[in-house]
């Protein structure tokens, strides 16, 4: 079986301030088992945007039902976008581990650009 890939099909997305951004992400396999997390930016300074496993992320909704066993769509919507939300977003697959999950594979990233709301 081929190794899981994380696909972010959109290289960039342009959203008006105040609107909702949809960031698409799919996995090519159900294996390995483990959660998805979304980050803005890469490296040690990256911001956690959504964690499938825990936390409260009020501005984020998932496009699909992540609790479904066969789900491979990890796309998210971020509401009420502001200029501070601009950046590159990465969909990252983790492999279930003990005590901590281990980062397994990242998508190529989607750059979110925010344009001012027309006055």
């Amino acid at each position: 079986e081929e190794e899981l890939q994380v696909i972010q099909p959109d290289k960039s997305v342009l959203v008006a301030a105040g609107e909702t951004a949809t960031l698409r992400c799919t996995a090519t396999s159900l294996i390995p088992v483990g959660p998805i997390q979304w980050f803005r930016g890469a490296g040690p300074g990256r911001e956690l945007i959504y964690n499938q496993k825990e936390g409260h992320f009020p501005r984020v909704t998932t496009v699909s039902d992540l609790t479904k066993r066969n789900n491979m769509d990890f796309s998210i919507r971020i509401g009420n976008i502001t200029p501070a939300d601009a950046g590159t977003y990465y969909c990252v697959k983790f492999r279930k581990g003990s005590p901590d999950d281990v980062e397994f594979k990242s998508g190529a990233g989607t750059e979110l650009s925010v344009r001012a709301k027309p006055s």
Epitope: A17, G45, R59, A84, D85
Partner: antibody, heavy 118, light 108 residues
Framework: VQLVESGGGVVRPGESLRLSCAAS????????MNWVRQAPGEGLEWVSR????????DYAESVKGRFTISRDNSENTLYLQMNSLRAEDTAVYYC????????????WGLGALVTVSS | ETVLTQSPATLSVSPGERATLSCRAS??????LAWHQQKPGQAPRLLIY???NRATGIPDRFSGSGSGTDFTLTISSLQTEDSAVYYC??????????FGGGTKVEIK
């Protein structure tokens, strides 16, 4: 949600102090955290922010190069290392939880008083 | 940098009356504005976020309105326990996070 600061006290100008903020009642490692201060009789001044993982930090110009924010997600604790303290750093220092990565402060600690005086 | 200007600096209101506090931003902050209440000797407490949403446990006599650059916090029927300083905070552009200078609400 509970945030409890400690480590405040009286120091002389040029000295150092480290504040701690013990967090409980929420998934600490999922949230950005901040320090906000309030000089006696004055308003609120944001001091510093650290992202959920601890690798990203921001500082107010007034403290840049002197203060360092850090966190220990395994201990659910936020820190503020304050070096080269000045009289104008005298304030109550609050730790504040951020609602999401780009948001307001939804919970505040009770504060720790730092007095810098010769 | 976005500057938040609160007015009036002090507001004196009789119990049961309406209190209206203003916060003006130097540039648009969309709906990304919060209000915090600070009673004497206490830590701040979140009242309103995203300009109009009441935080958990906040009585419905507190309401927020506005968007863009002009925002209002209204206390519909002032209670004695509402005596406090009220701060607005923007989170549209950051860093830095900015607070207004505060409005002190006194009971007449």
């Amino acid at each position: 949600v509970q945030l409890v600061e400690s480590g405040g006290g009286v120091v002389r100008p040029g000295e150092s102090l480290r504040l701690s903020c013990a967090a409980s009642g929420f998934s600490f490692s999922s949230y950005a955290m901040n320090w906000v201060r309030q000089a006696p009789g004055e308003g609120l001044e944001w001091v510093s922010r650290i992202n959920s993982g601890g690798g990203g930090t921001d500082y107010a110009e007034s403290v840049k190069g002197r203060f360092t924010i850090s966190r220990d997600n395994s201990e659910n604790t936020l820190y503020l290392q304050m070096n080269s303290l000045r009289a104008e750093d005298t304030a109550v220092y609050y730790c504040a939880k951020q609602y999401d990565w780009n948001g307001f402060f939804d919970y505040w600690g009770l504060g720790a008083l730092v007095t810098v005086s010769s | 940098e976005t500057v938040l200007t609160q007015s009036p600096a002090t507001l004196s209101v009789s119990p049961g009356e309406r209190a209206t506090l203003s916060c003006r931003a130097s540039q648009t902050v969309g709906s990304k504005l919060a209000w915090h209440q600070q009673k004497p000797g206490q830590a701040p407490r979140l009242l309103i976020y995203d300009a109009t949403n009441r935080a958990t446990g906040i009585p419905d006599r507190f309401s927020g309105s506005g968007s863009g650059t002009d925002f209002t916090l209204t206390i519909s029927s002032l209670q004695t326990e509402d005596s406090a300083v009220y701060y607005c905070q923007q989170y549209y552009y950051w860093p830095p996070y900015r607070f207004g200078g505060g409005t002190k609400v006194e009971i007449k």
